[in-house]
Amino acid sequence: LEVQVPEDPVVALVGTDATLCCSFSPEPGFSLAQLNLIWQLTDTKQLVHSFAEGQDQGSAYANRTALFPDLLAQGNASLRLQRVRVADEGSFTCFVSIRDFGSAAVSLQVAAPYSKPSMTLEPNKDLRPGDTVTITCSSYRGYPEAEVFWQDGQGVPLTGNVTTSQMANEQGLFDVHSVLRVVLGANGTYSCLVRNPVLQQDAHGSVTITGQPMTFP
């Protein structure tokens, strides 16, 4: 029995619902009395959802999964995963048994966009050209880990004297703090770009230092 799943990972935003697609080709006149369906975590073999003896056996996965009743007899064994969490990321296997048996695995990639970075400056007053300042760029509650880039007002990348740390909170979402140490010129704009590599989403923050006062656009 051929079981079909998408080759590419399913990308789902944290807190939204995801559909893990799985399909088979039923013969004409097929009914659900003939179907055994199991969804499980590929690595641990933990049961996620099942259908057997003509009945949806329900979710074994925190009551957050559901099948598509009107579509099951048509060969659509897809699983709806509600309120996606970081911990859901991984591979799910769809096992279908009628008279024959088949299985296939689909990957779930979880993502969350990063917030617009907030910029802080230390010291933040009485600045003169030639002073060394520390600029901190902070962005919150993203997933997976971010890529952080700094550049000056001319778009020139700033790679030296950058320290970036990322900490996961209790939900598995990352807060990123990137610190740039720089010697001030006469005028200066410093930009931080926080990129989510899965969503290809960029969050921008910048600070412009023009003697006095500073501006945070």
């Epitope: 097929f30 009395a33 009107d70 579509l71 048509q74 659509n76």
Partner: antibody, heavy 117, light 107 residues
Framework: EVQLLESGGGLVQPGGSLRLSCAAS????????MIWVRQAPGKGLEWVSI????????SYAQKFQGRFTISRDNSKNTLYLQMNSLRAEDTAVYYC??????????WGQGTLVTVSS | EIVLTQSPGTLSLSPGERATLSCHAS??????VAWYQQKPGQAPRLLIY???NRATGIPDRFSGSGSGTDFTLTISHLEPEDFAVYYC?????????FGQGTKVEIK
């Protein structure tokens, strides 16, 4: 607005052919199973055919197998029903509907097919 | 194919009364039943799916119950706009089928 609009109905002679269209708007057509249902004058609803989102898997009520063909063009957001060897008893209003996974949740207004000499 | 038999064929009731419509399946179909309402000259409208879940926008005077072979649609308090034909439908088989319908008419 989520909408289905059937067209292509009309008067046709017995033995003739007709192609019905169902234009979808307001939702991602290519993500849904779609069906055709018909209703003869004064009678009940009768399922005709169903297609999966790609159009690669189809199913028919036995009486329509071989005479009717369901197809879709996802680039045009349109569902079709090709009806051949039409008979007087095929006279009916033909509806297309979206299969939402929780019932047939969106229906068109129907198109009348009359088979008569 | 799975045959759905609805009863009664016609139900004559007055506004405000309770309507109980039945649908019997020729074999067990778990809870894979939906109910539709159809008014003259209009397309059907989804009322209930999975035997007991109300579709979006459906008033709570409509309720569904049952599992296996016997299913019921109840309209607790008939409103004038509820007089129509009601169909049950099963998705348990690849070959989808509807019941023949129950007409709810004004007494």
């Amino acid at each position: 607005e989520v909408q289905l609009l059937e067209s292509g109905g009309g008067l046709v002679q017995p033995g003739g052919s007709l192609r019905l269209s169902c234009a979808a708007s307001g939702f991602t057509f290519s993500a849904y199973y779609m069906i055709w249902v018909r209703q003869a004058p004064g009678k009940g609803l009768e399922w005709v055919s169903i297609t999966n989102p790609s159009g690669g898997v189809t199913s028919y009520a036995q009486k329509f197998q071989g005479r009717f063909t369901i197809s879709r063009d996802n680039s045009k957001n349109t569902l079709y029903l090709q009806m051949n060897s039409l008979r007087a008893e095929d006279t009916a209003v033909y509806y297309c509907a979206r299969v939402g996974g929780r019932g047939f949740d969106i229906w068109g207004q129907g198109t009348l097919v009359t088979v008569s000499s | 194919e799975i045959v759905l038999t609805q009863s009664p064929g016609t139900l004559s009731l007055s506004p405000g009364e309770r309507a109980t419509l039945s649908c019997h399946a020729s074999q067990g179909i778990s809870n894979y039943v939906a109910w539709y309402q159809q008014k003259p000259g209009q397309a059907p409208r989804l009322l209930i799916y999975d035997a007991s879940n109300r579709a979006t926008g459906i008033p709570d005077r409509f309720s569904g119950s049952g599992s296996g072979t016997d299913f019921t649609l109840t309209i607790s308090h008939l409103e004038p706009e509820d007089f129509a034909v009601y169909y049950c439908q099963q998705s348990y088989s690849t070959l989808l089928t509807f019941g023949q319908g129950t007409k709810v008419e004004i007494k």
